[in-house]
């Protein structure tokens, strides 16, 4: 069965600076990865990127940078800033499109206890919703 | 430019385990993943899995599934692959490799490769 | 998992010659294929990537097509360093190589 798993970490040397990261654990070819804050994509969430396997990626403010960080995996940078540092509180979602599988979304958030530097622990998220 | 520079030849008994290094030097190595790859002697290549140091998660092969664990420490940027229950049909030269890829699609190949370890598997 | 099929599995060839070698995959893989190089008791060395694309420092007589399930390595015209065993990889679905292809002197 597939799984994605969404980790977010806080920068060290940057406390405005977050990163998301999530992955498509599973036998599928990934058609689409869509991040989004606030909730699931198209339940209540705000779209941050989306990354597509050949046309490249596109992010909205406040994501700094989208990238492929293996063929099943993403990263995607954000830049807060506001003093009050909302992403803490934060739940980002991941969902991947695969073929044949259909769509997977896993939820996740910066740990209350998080210090700089640290971040969720790396076991796959739940997942929330398959299409 | 990366190199990868991997730890020495083993000789394991059946059913022990083996841990075999991959220490990088001169780039950063917790964005990129790192994939182990197998060649038995006279055969052909075989991808084991591979890990993004930064999220400490791996990815697994179906085949070696429950029996190859990879790991990876940041703080010296060595990247490891522990193989249990091992048989002599797991003799092989093991090697490291760097996932590299633009980033903005999802290409992905295997560039730079560590000299390979090999493991011999003999009671 | 998606298969590779290389042929053919070896080849004769001299100095000079235009070597073709082929790799099919088991089910569309786009152009998420790499080709690499291995001379014995060496790593593999990586020529082509995506395919088509001609890694750094590797000679312009090494060139890839192909898409889908279908693809190709070509070389213009053999040169001695070239005898050696090339491979081709799947890299949409995990990762997958070919059997591998061997390169001999005619």
């Known amino acids: 069965t597939p799984e994605v798993w969404v980790q977010v970490q806080m920068e060290a040397t940057e406390l405005s600076s977050f990163t998301v990261h999530c992955g498509f654990l599973g036998p599928g070819s990934i058609s689409l990865v869509t991040v989004s804050w606030g909730g699931p994509d198209g339940a209540g969430g705000t779209k941050l990127a989306v990354l597509h396997p050949e046309l490249g990626t596109r992010q909205w403010a406040p994501a700094r940078q989208a990238r492929w960080e293996t063929q099943s995996s993403i990263s995607l940078a954000l830049e807060d800033s506001g003093a009050s540092s909302p992403f803490a509180n934060t739940t980002f979602c991941c969902k991947f499109a695969s073929f044949p599988e259909g769509s997977w979304e896993s939820c996740g958030s910066l740990p209350p206890s998080s210090d700089p530097g640290l971040s969720a622990p790396p076991t796959p998220v739940p997942i929330l919703r398959a299409d | 430019q990366v190199q990868l520079v991997q730890s020495g030849a083993e000789v394991k008994k059946p059913g022990s385990s083996v841990k075999v290094s991959c220490k990088a030097s001169?780039?950063?190595?917790?964005?990129?993943?790192i994939s182990w790859v197998r060649q038995a002697p006279g055969q052909g290549l075989e991808w084991m899995g591979n890990?993004?140091?930064?999220?400490?998660?791996?990815n697994y092969a179906q085949k070696f599934q429950g029996r190859v664990t990879i790991t990876a420490d940041e703080s010296t940027s060595t990247a490891y692959m522990e193989l249990s229950s091992l048989r002599s049909e797991d003799t092989a030269v093991y090697y490291c490799?760097?996932?590299?890829?633009?980033?903005?699609?999802?290409?992905?190949?295997?560039?730079?490769w560590g000299q390979g370890t090999l493991v011999t598997v003999s009671s | 998992d998606i298969q590779m099929t290389q042929s053919p599995s070896s080849l004769s060839a001299s100095v000079g010659d235009r070597v073709t070698i082929t790799c099919r995959a088991s089910?569309?893989?786009?152009?998420?294929l790499n080709w690499y190089q291995q001379k014995p008791g060496k790593a593999p060395k990586l020529l082509i990537y995506?395919?088509?694309s001609l890694q750094s420092g590797v000679p312009s007589r090494f060139s890839g097509s192909g898409s889908g399930t279908d693809f190709t390595l070509t070389i213009s015209s053999l040169q001695p360093e070239d005898f050696a065993t090339y491979y081709c990889?799947?890299?949409?679905?995990?990762?997958?190589f070919g059997g591998g292809t061997k390169v001999e002197i005619k």
């Open positions: 990889q799947q890299s949409d679905i995990l990762y997958t």
């Open positions: 890990i993004i140091p930064i999220v400490g998660i791996a």
């Open positions: 001169g780039g950063t190595f917790s964005s990129a993943a």
């Open positions: 995506a395919a088509s």
């Open positions: 089910q569309s893989i786009s152009s998420y």
């Open positions: 490799a760097r996932d590299t890829g633009r980033g903005y699609t999802r290409h992905f190949w295997f560039d730079p």
